[in-house]
């Protein structure tokens, strides 16, 4: 079925938004673990499997909102499921940080996917 | 405290639009999204869409492609759905909610707006 | 669009008892999935977000667990104030969709 009308947020939207909640920032949602995920392996859908459990922490509402458009859509960047580092858990920031770096660089290389 | 107050009941004829307001207070309304969910007469719920007053960003539900739109007033922390084309099919209580704990689900409702489609 | 089916459609429990409702989604929606409770004439209440935690204000006689495609929402010792109308929605993918609903009344 279709999927929901909405411009997608574009990469470089994705970029700008993880910039801004990354910059000056040591921590994020108070610290928060998540498990770590395999970007490659659909880096929208996995960064949401992932990002999808913390609660309470307005700041990657955003973020995680986008991540869903982009998830959602079909034919999707990543709507194979990922594999999760089940024995790997980080804080919230860094996988936003390494989100940031991987999307930087597919964005770069022109791969949108 | 969270709270969203809607705009009162409305008789549309088929054909012409409804405009449902929902004053948001307690909280920074750009902060968080504003949702729109309707309920026909005895029926379920059906989530229509979101929009995010902060950039104004809006994703909505296909099944109303073309027909509704929302906005924000950030001036005065409300948040507008407006729907055209009305039918029969679309008599429901229109709700708006907000999302605080976990993103997209809503968990701070307004009261309902009741739209009926009459000629 | 993810198809939720939750069953049953209706409840008749006596108080004390537990209640089980179930909700199966026609994917994978990981932990993105909620429950809510309306009351004839209200707006709907929040009680249950991410499987299964519970907002505040919420007693423990709710719970919900599951995982993937299948989950379940637990009313211990029903009350009489636990009637009304349950929802699950699903918040892994947009258009964000809702089970049908199931009516839970005391015997």
């Known amino acids: 079925s279709p999927s929901p009308v909405t411009p997608s947020p574009t990469l470089k939207e994705l970029i700008e938004e993880l910039v801004n909640i990354t910059q000056n920032q040591a921590s994020l949602c108070n610290g928060s673990m998540v498990w770590s995920v395999n970007l490659t392996a659909g880096m929208y859908c996995a960064a949401l499997e992932s990002l999808i459990n913390v609660s309470d922490c307005s700041a990657i509402q955003r973020t995680q909102r986008m991540l869903k458009a982009l998830c959602s859509q079909k034919p999707a960047a990543g709507q194979i499921s990922s594999e999760r580092s089940r024995d790997t858990k980080i804080e919230v920031i860094q996988l936003v940080k390494n989100l940031l770096t991987y999307v930087r660089g597919v964005y770069r290389h022109g791969n949108f996917r | 405290e969270v709270q969203l107050v809607q705009s009162g009941a409305e008789v549309v004829k088929p054909g012409a639009s409804v405009k449902v307001s929902c004053k948001t207070s307690g909280y920074s309304f750009t902060d968080y999204p504003i949702y729109w969910v309707r309920q026909a007469p005895g029926a379920g719920l059906e989530w229509i869409g979101y929009?995010?007053?902060?950039?104004?960003?809006?994703t909505y539900n296909q099944n109303f492609k073309d027909r509704v739109t929302l906005t924000a007033d950030k001036s005065t922390s409300t948040a507008y759905m407006e729907l055209s084309s009305l039918r029969a099919g679309d008599i429901a209580v229109y709700y708006c909610?907000?999302?605080?704990?976990?993103?997209?689900?809503?968990?701070?409702w307004g009261q309902g707006t009741l739209v009926t489609v009459s000629s | 669009d993810i198809v939720m089916t939750q069953t049953p459609l209706s409840l008749s429990v006596s108080p004390g008892e537990t209640a089980s409702i179930s909700c199966k989604a026609s994917q994978s929606l990981r932990s993105a999935l909620a429950w809510f409770r309306q009351k004839p004439g209200q707006s709907p209440q929040r009680l249950i977000y991410?499987?299964?935690n519970r907002y505040p204000g919420v007693p423990d006689r709710f719970s919900g667990s599951g995982s993937g495609t299948d989950f379940t929402l637990r009313i211990s010792r029903v009350e009489a104030e636990d009637t009304g109308v349950y929802y699950c929605?699903?918040?892994?993918?947009?258009?964000?969709?809702f089970g049908a609903g199931t009516k839970v009344e005391l015997k």
């Open positions: 909610a907000t999302a605080v704990v976990a993103t997209d689900v809503m968990e701070n």
């Open positions: 929605l699903q918040h892994w993918q947009f258009p964000l969709t």
């Open positions: 929009i995010d007053p902060y950039n104004g960003g809006t």
């Open positions: 991410l499987v299964s």
